[in-house]
Every structure is written in C-alpha cells, then in structure tokens.
C-alpha cells in the first residue's frame, strides 16, 4: 500500500478515503514532493505582506512587503519599516545618523565613517549622514613635489547634507 502512495506526484496527495488514489491538492493548498498523505495550506500574504508569487499545487506562495517596508526573517516572515538614507530605525521610528556615522541605504544601522588615518591616508571627501568619507592619498604623497593626477575635491562640511 505504501508503494501506491509513493507514486503520487507533487501537486497531489494519497487519499486514504479513496483507496489511496492520488487526488489533486484542493484549492489554496500544495504538495511540493511526491508521496504526501496531505497537502499543506498555502501561506497567506495578508496585511503588511503582498503576494510576490502565487501558490500553485506544487509550490507555496511567496510574500513580499508593501511599499515603505522591507522583508526580514526567513521567507519574509516580518516587514520592517523603511527609513531614508542618512537615518536608522530605532524602536521609536526613523532617526538621523549621529555625527560621524552614515547609512547609504533605506534599512540597516548607521555605521562609523572610515578612519582614513588607520590606513595612512587622508580624507579626500568629508563624510555625511548618507555617505562615508572618501580616503585619498597619504599625507606624504601630497607633500610638495609629489605629483597628483587629480586635485582633491572640495570638502563638504561634515555631517551636513540636503534632506
């Protein structure tokens, strides 16, 4: 009898009520492997979730987040609020990055600017809330007599940028 069930393909289940005939999965359910005794209910993309891929008889639905949110967790099990570049999400909502930190994405945390001097380099372009500093040649490379192919870009005031 077990052999009869193993013949049931994905998208069907082995129906014990009908002499182990392979019956199609009912609507809103699926079986992704053969030989299943039941079909699983499809995941429901509801509320903050929107459907990225419809459920089929052989594969589960896949969800995404509505506009203004991005996925977190395995298989997009949660949606986290987006912030603007130059901000990070706290428990109380989006907050601007503190001076000396930046975030160039709509998600994640503010990270410290690169410390150019650790690599023996100098700051070519100052950092902002949205962008890391740009490191340039080392101070020694900029000493009189050293050639530079491109002059340094004018530095913006640190920590300030248009909102």
């Amino acid at each position: 009898l077990q052999d009869l069930c193993s013949n049931c393909p994905a998208g069907t289940f082995c129906d014990n009520n009908r002499s182990q005939i392979c019956s199609p999965c009912p609507p809103n359910s699926f079986s992704s492997a053969g030989g299943q005794r039941t079909c699983d209910i499809c995941r429901q993309c509801k509320g903050v979730f929107k459907t990225r891929k419809e459920c089929s008889s052989t594969s589960n639905a896949e969800c995404d987040c509505i506009s203004g949110y991005h996925c977190l967790g395995a298989e997009c099990s949660m949606c986290e609020q987006d912030c603007k570049q130059g901000q990070e999400l706290t428990k109380k909502g989006c907050k601007d990055c503190c001076f000396g930190t930046f975030n160039d994405q709509k998600r994640g945390i503010c990270r410290p600017w690169t410390n150019c001097s650790l690599d023996g380099k100098s700051v070519l372009v100052n950092g902002t809330k949205e962008r890391d500093v740009v490191c340039g040649p080392s101070p020694a490379d900029l000493s009189p007599g050293a050639s530079s192919a491109t002059p340094p870009a004018p530095a913006r005031e640190p920590g300030h940028s248009p909102q």
């Epitope: 509801k46 509320g47 903050v48 099990s77 949660m78 986290e80 428990k91 109380k92």
Partner: antibody, heavy 123, light 106 residues
Framework: EVQLVESGGGLVQPGGSLRLSCAAS??????????VGWIRQAPGKCLEWLAL???????YYSPSLKSRLTISRDNSKNTLYLQLNSLRAEDTAVYYC???????????????WGQGTLVTVSS | DIQLTQSPSSLSASVGDRVTITCRAS??????LAWYQQKPGKAPKLLIY???NLETGVPSRFSGSGSGTDFTLTISSLQPEDFATYYC????????FGCGTKVEIK
C-alpha cells in the same frame, strides 16, 4: 503611546445582535501596514481569533464564524467595530481588540491589546 | 485550518526552575509563531514573535525556538511574576491560538 479601548459589552438576549467598538489612539487605523482585529475568550477557555481588518480595508474572518461576523472601521473616528449576529450562550466571552505587529517591525502577531469588554448572552 | 497543540496543559514549578512549554502545529508554519503571557483578568501580553524574537521590554529569561511544526518557549529561571497562562499563536494562514499552558506554583 498606542491605546485600544473596547466598549459595547453587556447582557444580550439569545438570538440578538451586538456591536462592539474599539477606540484606537497613538496610531491611525489607515496607516500602511496596520491591521487591527478582534479576539475573544470565553470564561476559563482558550483565546479565539475572530476577525481582522487592515489599512487597505481587506477583511479576514474566522471560517467557523464568518456568516455571523462583520468587521468595519470609521477612519474619521479612528474606531474599529465588530458586529456579531444570532447570538448564542456560547458567545459569552471577553472580547479583545488587538493591533497586529509591533512598532517598527510588523508581522502576523498582536503586540497591543485592549482591556477587553465582557459580553454575556443569556435570557 | 491550522491547529496548534500546546503541552503540557498545566505544570507546577518553583521559583528558579527552568520551564519549557511546547507548541506543535498541524502543518509547517515556517517561523510564523508568537508566544503570549496572560494573567487572570488581564489581556494577553506579547513575549516572543517570529518564533524567537524577544518583544521590547520582555525579560531575557524568556526565549523562543523552533520552526516548521515544533516550537518551544523556555523560561530559564522562573520568577514569582511568571506564574500565568502561556499561549502560542500562528499567523501563517489566518490566525489561530493554542489552548494555553498554565504555570502554577508547586
């Protein structure tokens, strides 16, 4: 601060109807991503999810009670409603209003609950 | 519908004990599981969401684990204020609650 305050409970005759209200404050019922629902608990029994409405006005109902339930909201009053018809003794319970998700991370759980309102169905 | 079965339905424990409560789903629900604590006459309080994430303000002695069909809530060292009833809840398809586990004083 998020607050949910239920009202409308009391003694109802079998076969009658009831309309419960849930006044929300600290957030808007129409904010993208927000869902608010009703959950009940009969005396000494389990929690039972009844219905939920989301910001886009999509409504979800418990299959076993769908024919007797109507969930709605009034955005201008920031208030949620639940209508339950053809009341029976087994509908006697505390009815809770609850908001889906937490503050910045939203999913299919309930982080905020009202204090509940008691509905007694008896003749 | 998706059913959730909690075990045990009740347990007796002492302050300082490690307590484990399980919740089994009738089919795979990924990590779409939350845990709540409820005290008599009060509304449930969210403890854990997405199977293992601790809600803000909940003590770190509470932890959740599991995915698919089997989930666990653990209280590492039971405190006097932890005597209550605990419920699991799934949000994979509609919403369903387990029937609770009452944690009583031994």
């Amino acid at each position: 601060e998020v607050q949910l305050v239920e009202s409308g409970g009391g003694l109802v005759q079998p076969g009658g109807s009831l309309r419960l209200s849930c006044a929300a404050s600290g957030f808007s019922l129409s904010t993208g991503g927000v869902g608010v629902g009703w959950i009940r608990q009969a005396p000494g029994k389990c929690l039972e999810w009844l219905a939920l409405i989301d910001w886009a006005d999509d409504k979800y109902y418990s299959p076993s009670l769908k024919s007797r339930l109507t969930i709605s909201r009034d955005n201008s009053k920031n208030t949620l409603y639940l209508q339950l018809n053809s009341l029976r003794a087994e509908d006697t319970a505390v009815y809770y209003c609850a908001r889906g998700g937490s503050d910045t991370v939203i999913g299919d759980w309930f982080a905020y609950w009202g204090q509940g309102t008691l509905v007694t169905v008896s003749s | 519908d998706i059913q959730l079965t909690q075990s045990p339905s009740s347990l007796s424990a002492s302050v300082g004990d490690r307590v484990t409560i399980t919740c089994r789903a009738s089919q795979s629900i990924g990590s779409y599981l939350a845990w709540y604590q409820q005290k008599p006459g009060k509304a449930p309080k969210l403890l854990i969401y997405d199977a293992s994430n601790l809600e803000t303000g909940v003590p770190s002695r509470f932890s959740g684990s599991g995915s698919g069909t089997d989930f666990t809530l653990t209280i590492s060292s039971l405190q006097p204020e932890d005597f209550a009833t605990y419920y699991c809840q799934q949000g994979y398809y509609l919403w369903t609650f387990g029937c609770g586990t009452k944690v009583e004083i031994k």
